[in-house]
Amino acid sequence: QQQTLPKPFIWAEPHFMVPKEKQVTICCQGNYGAVEYQLHFEGSLFAVDRPKPPERINKVQFYIPDMNSRMAGQYSCIYRVGELWSEPSNLLDLVVTEMYDTPTLSVHPGPEVISGEKVTFYCRLDTATSMFLLLKEGRSSHVQRGYGKVQAEFPLGPVTTAHRGTYRCFGSYNNHAWSFPSEPVKLLVTGDIENTSLAPEDPTFPADTWGTYLLTTETGLQKDHALWDHTAQNLLR
């Protein structure tokens, strides 16, 4: 006899990276007929929603109108059908950004390289942080984590044209509180000398739309909850 229901999916709209003082909605999708959803924050009950009518609703939303560092952390949700509770969802890491300072991002040997060259990004922030995050803008969140007193190295190794794109970095004051994003660095990777055609890449956003990027639901993440859970879970681990 089944003792628990399947775990629900959890995700954040428009994005799990939320600039401070902006709004975010945490979504929890369970099953039709669920009479109660509970949202847990850092292991404690945070909010409850009882959908009406439960047989016509399989998703609830928990709205956070004003993001701040106290609201950043790990969320999970569960739901109940009758007296039977579900397994807890995967953990959602909700991150507050635009905290304190702005790092600088640079690239070695430079912003235009030939396929096969070794490329390293450097993220520098002079204030009190030792963890840095490098993100490639695009449809999926390519995130690397690095450490250093004021500057972290992010070796990409020998690059291919798939590494083309626009990169930003953040300083991280803790796992869930990040700095303002750096200015973008666009990496151009050409083929060999004879063939400088450029390969397709993730769609990138213009530098002046980074704020919009943070506040735009990434394509497919709502539809592909497994990908969303995977991205959110592995981002900071």
């Epitope: 640079s106 070695h108 235009e112 390289v113 450097y122 050409t190 000398i193």
Partner: nanobody, 122 residues
Framework: DVQLVESGGGSVEAGGSLRLSCAAS??????MGWFRQAPGKAREGVAC??????????DYADSVKGRFTITQDNAKNTVYLQMNSLKPEDTAMYYC???????????????WGQGTQVTVSS
């Protein structure tokens, strides 16, 4: 190993010009630049240049934009800093740097010259 030799420093009145040169021996340097340090102050970036496969990129500190120009002669493996409209606050020891990250970032493998003094009087 890379050796960097600067030249072209000197004294000039405000509004004048100087041209600094930095010759790099050894392998060709793709990202080279200039930093400066005034007495009692921290070292600060001035300008850098990166030669990519098809494009040359330059970056300048806000305080020198429109007044200083960095160029590179790949054949001579030399970088130049043309400094126009000099101000007293440009007075400093100017250091050539090679193997930077772009834009204008010191990394563990950055190499340094001995420096050349620039003095701008009012």
């Amino acid at each position: 190993d890379v050796q960097l030799v600067e030249s072209g420093g000197g004294s000039v009145e405000a509004g004048g010009s100087l041209r600094l040169s930095c010759a790099a021996s050894g392998y060709r340097q793709r990202t080279m630049g200039w930093f400066r340090q005034a007495p009692g102050k921290a070292r600060e970036g001035v300008a850098c240049i990166y030669t990519g496969p098809t494009t040359t990129f330059t970056d300048y500190a806000d305080s020198v934009k429109g007044r200083f120009t960095i160029t590179q002669d790949n054949a001579k493996n030399t970088v130049y800093l043309q400094m126009n409209s000099l101000k007293p606050e440009d007075t400093a020891m100017y250091y050539c740097a090679a193997n930077l990250a772009y834009p204008l970032t010191i990394i563990p493998d950055t190499r340094w010259g001995q420096g050349t003094q620039v003095t701008v009087s009012s």
